[in-house]
Interface confidence: low
């Protein structure tokens, strides 16, 4: 599923993102955006072995199990391939876990490089939330 | 336990088309990668490809883009592999293999035979 | 591509011969190798994983060693039921690649 901006917004908050761990919706939305441009099913490869699943783009080597990874941890003890869900539970679950994980939102690249200090307010102005 | 079951041998001549099954049980389907390897005599082993069932998502060999094409059903647990064009190159033993960087589990393997 | 080379392409031995064949990647690989047994006419039987990992099953006579881009598999005191061909394989990047094979048969 690929999400609109706003409806994103509104799933995010109503699974409680809004404000979580002290960052704003706004910062959700922007990290979504730049990991998987909205996309449930994105995935992508590192060249660790590892592979990014989902709209927030969760790492096999740590957070899920893809049953490929070589030394995968699995911390949100879940299949990679239900990050993969239009339902967004279990991407937003295992983020709760990572951004709480002591580094914050650091943990997306993208977000640290494209949303990081900027007006990521922009990302939900409009929305009905 | 696991088992991958896939289609039986196919003779079929130049320039057609074919669709190879592998059907998977004992596990989640959607959660592992399925794989696509290559067997001719004296060519030894080729990796063609994978895809994973759950998305749909699929990664193929530079080699073998525009021959090969993956498809899954969830429904059935079933992994396609549409090999199209066929030449005397393609006739090979092709296997599907559930993938976790190493293929633990294996299909039986099935003989294309590609012959006018 | 990683290429891998095994070596050597055949090895002829008695039974109760202890043998080890060769894998070389040509570049580091960490321990991402795997081994595989293949009969004739079977499909290929994973050995040995992540270069020194004994897979399930695979008795202890079959062990693996070696780390970046040099790999050994070594069988102590070859059985019949051993004789076939053995590949390694890496996992290290893609496109997955396979060795060429080594041919084990009785002398």
């Known amino acids: 599923k690929v999400f609109g901006r706003c409806e994103l917004a509104a799933a995010m908050k109503r699974h409680g993102l809004d404000n979580y761990r002290g960052y704003s919706l706004g910062n959700w939305v922007c990290a979504a955006k730049f990991e998987s441009n909205f996309n449930t099913q994105a995935t992508n490869r590192n060249t660790d072995g590892s592979t990014d699943y989902g709209i927030l783009q969760i790492n096999s080597r740590w957070w899920c199990n893809d049953g490929r990874t070589p030394g995968s941890r699995n911390l949100c003890n879940i299949p990679c391939s239900a990050l993969l869900s239009s339902d967004i539970t279990a991407s937003v679950n295992c983020a709760k876990k990572i951004v709480s994980d002591g580094n914050g939102m650091n943990a997306w690249v993208a977000w640290r490089n494209r949303c990081k200090g900027t007006d990521v307010q922009a990302w939900i102005r409009g929305c009905r939330l | 336990q696991v088992q991958l079951q896939e289609s039986g041998a196919e003779v079929m001549k130049p320039g057609a088309s074919v669709k190879i099954s592998c059907k998977a049980t004992g596990y989640t389907f959607t959660t592992y990668w399925i794989e696509w390897v290559k067997q001719r005599p004296g060519h030894g082993l080729e990796w063609i490809g994978e895809?994973?069932?759950?998305?749909?998502?699929?990664y193929y060999n530079e080699k073998f883009k525009g021959k090969a094409t993956f498809t899954a059903d969830t429904s059935s647990n079933t992994a396609y592999m549409q090999l199209s064009s066929l030449t005397s190159e393609d006739s090979a033993v092709y296997y599907c293999?559930?993938?976790?960087?190493?293929?633990?589990?294996w299909g039986q393997g099935t003989t294309l035979t590609v012959s006018s | 591509d990683i290429e891998l080379t095994q070596s050597p392409a055949t090895l002829s031995v008695t039974p109760g011969d202890s043998v080890s064949l060769s894998c070389r990647a040509s570049?580091?690989?960490?321990?991402?190798l795997h081994w595989y047994q293949q009969k004739s006419h079977e499909s290929p039987r994973l050995l040995i994983k992540?270069?020194?990992q004994r897979a399930s099953g695979i008795p202890s006579r079959f062990s693996g060693s070696g780390s970046g881009t040099d790999f050994t598999l070594s069988i102590n005191s070859v059985e019949t039921e051993d004789f076939g061909m053995y590949f390694c394989?890496?996992?290290?990047?893609?496109?997955?690649?396979f060795g060429g094979g080594t041919k084990l048969e009785i002398k």
């Open positions: 570049q580091s690989i960490s321990n991402n």
């Open positions: 895809i994973l069932p759950g998305s749909g998502s699929t």
């Open positions: 394989q890496q996992s290290n990047s893609w496109p997955r690649t």
């Open positions: 293999a559930r993938g976790d960087g190493h293929y633990c589990y």
């Open positions: 992540y270069a020194s």
